[in-house]
Structure formats: C-alpha cells, structure tokens
Interface confidence: low
Amino acid sequence: EVEKTACPSGKKAREIDESLIFYKKWELEACVDAALLATQMDRVNAIPFTYEQLDVLKHKLDELYPQGYPESVIQHLGYLFLKMSPEDIRKWNVTSLETLKALLEVNKGHEMSPQVATLIDRFVKGRGQLDKDTLDTLTAFYPGYLCSLSPEELSSVPPSSIWAVRPQDLDTCDPRQLDVLYPKARLAFQNMNGSEYFVKIQSFLGGAPTEDLKALSQQNVSMDLATFMKLRTDAVLPLTVAEVQKLLGPHVEGLKAEERHRPVRDWILRQRQDDLDTLGLGLQGGIPNGYLVLDLSMQEALS
C-alpha cells in the first residue's frame, strides 16, 4: 500500500461527510485535507467512523498542530478525544468550561480514564482554582472526583464552591480530605439557621473538631448513626455521655449495635460506667465506679 499515496481521481474530499466511512485508511490519509478536517471537526462526531479511521484523522491533526490543538478543534473532537493520549492532552490549553463539558460527555458512563484525569488537571491548573461552575460540572460527571484530590489540591477549593457538593460526592473521602473540606463548608454555610445548617454540614462532619460537635449537641440536631460513625475518633472521645445523647437524640439507641466499632468502642472505654448506664442501653466497658480518670493530654500540657 506504500505506492498508493496519491488520492485516486474523484476521491478528494470536498467536505467531511458520511461518504468518508467507506474510504480505506490510505485513502483517508491521501484524500482528506488536514485543514478541512480542522474546520469541520464538528461533523466527525456525527459520522460513525471505525477506530482505525479515527486513528488516521488524529494523525492528520497531529501533523497540522504539532504543538497541540487549538481550542476550536478540541471542543469538537467528540469520539476522537478517546484516541488522545495524556501526552497529547498536556499540549492543550483548555480554558472554556463548554469545551470541558463536551469532552467529558464523550467519556460519560466510563470510568475516569488517564486522558480525562489529564484534561481536568490541565483545565483546573489553567483556572488557578476549582471554582463552583467547574466543580459542579466535574462532580456531575464523576461523583467521586472531589475525593480523588489530595488534601493539597483540595486546599485550592474556594468555600463558595462547596455549595456545589452533594453528599454522595464525599462518600469515598478519607479523614485527611474532610479535615480540609470541613472548615470551608463551615464558612460557606455559616449564615444558615440551625436545622438547615446541619443538613448542609452533615456530610462534612468527618472533619469536625470536638468543640463543633459539642456546639451541635446543643442544637437538637438528631444526628444519625451513619454520620456519627464517620466522625473523627479523636473528636468524639472527649464528648460526655450527655453530649452524645443530645447529639444523637432518638438515634442514641443505635449505639448498642455499634459498641464494638470505632469510634463508639473507643468512646465507651473513656466514659464512666455509671454515666453509660443512664442511657439504659446495656453498654459495657466503661470505667468502673471508684476509679480515678486521669486526662493524660491535660497532664502533658501542664508539664
């Protein structure tokens, strides 16, 4: 096929249309002008080319734009985006949210690929921070996106963007990530009233310190056990039995089912058995009556 480099008579493409899916690879290479392809990229996605044909089209664009594609081409890549390597994408300068959405749409339903991860990274770095619109878009396509970021990366999320976060977006976040996100959420929702505030802040409470949990216990919030089990152990340990009872409200009965699991198990070990007995749940493992409880952390602070 090496000698078949000239375009056969009458086969020169005048426009990008359906007839091209019947071209052999070498005919596409010889008969489709790269500049024509670049100006009519929006049509490529409407034509069911085979992947082998898409490889040829990509090769033509690569030759035309060795330094990276312009955004006008990138926005209309469609299925051709799936042919791009992370190395290709690193050459791009994507600034438009519409371009990002168009490319994420192509990958919709598939797991986040290295290409998509690189694209998002390029886009966010170009913007300087994860603004609300970007976060809205990314979490709509990839609910786990936020939890895939490092604590350092999360630090660039402005508090205003937290409004875009849904509870399921935080499902896979670990405590280190919630430690970064919680203060931002607290700031974002600070002007809401008690019950509304709790609904919004609830998903972020895995990063809350003891003093904030104590404050919540005074507000009749009725925290569910699932949320309680995600709290930081070190934040739960200093809470008194009375504070936990107020914090959980009617859900306090659920402690019995969780008494062998953290943070409930560790919290029980720190409480006086007398106090635990007041709950009437049969929780065992508290400090027996007559024992002196030394708060070692306080002792260390004084020495």
Epitope: A46, P48, T50, Y51, Y79, L82, H110, S113
Partner: nanobody, 116 residues
Framework: QVQLVESGGGLVQAGGSLRLSCAFS????????MSWYRQAPGKQRTVVAS???????SYADSVRGRFTISGENGKNTVYLQMNSLKLEDTAVYYC??????????WGQGTQVTVSS
C-alpha cells in the same frame, strides 16, 4: 470471552427480504459502534451499515433505502433488515462491535445468497 454471533442468513430470491441478527455475549459493557460488513468472493470486506450507541446510523450508497440497521444496545443485539435484495448483495455478512479503549470484535459471519 467476548463473542459476536450472526444469524439469519440464507438463500433468497432477488427482490426478497432477510433479517440478520447479531447477538454479543461475554461482556458487561455495550459497544460505542456496531456495524455490518460484507465480503463477496474475491472482494475486500466493506462496511454496509453502522449504528452508534446513541442511535446514529450510516449506510453505504449501494444499500441506502433498502437496508435498515437497528439495535438495542442495552439488549446486546443489532439487526440488519435487508429488503429488495439484489444479486450483488450475495456475500458473507459480518458483525463488528467496537468500543473505545477495547479492540474491535468480529463475528464469524453468516452467508447471504441471492438467486435469480
């Protein structure tokens, strides 16, 4: 093991109809693009019709208006309704499934013979 199995081929008189089916199994995903190709004796395999996962279709000029490709991607089957068959439609018809990041999968083919 991904398998594409074609059926529905056979001997038919010119002007008659056939409906080819392609069922794929052994995969939990759906294909981005399903196509029917054909290969006549001594000729290259060429694409006849294609359907994308969102329902876009495309046809070779020689079959447009006579053949209809359809499919329910979620049900893992694609069809080729062939009407007004001509002698030159005689060929082995192959099903092709393609998905991004995954190689293309071919079926074994089903023979269609149009007689006068």
């Amino acid at each position: 093991q991904v398998q594409l199995v074609e059926s529905g081929g056979g001997l038919v008189q010119a002007g008659g109809s056939l409906r080819l089916s392609c069922a794929f199994s052994g995969t939990t995903y759906t294909f981005d693009l399903m196509s029917w190709y054909r290969q006549a004796p001594g000729k290259q395999r060429t694409v006849v019709a294609s359907i994308s996962s969102d329902g876009r279709t495309s046809y070779a000029d020689s079959v447009r208006g006579r053949f209809t490709i359809s499919g329910e991607n979620g049900k893992n089957t694609v069809y080729l309704q062939m009407n007004s068959l001509k002698l030159e439609d005689t060929a082995v018809y192959y099903c092709l499934g393609q998905r991004s990041g995954v190689r293309a999968f071919w079926g074994q083919g089903t023979q269609v013979t149009v007689s006068s």
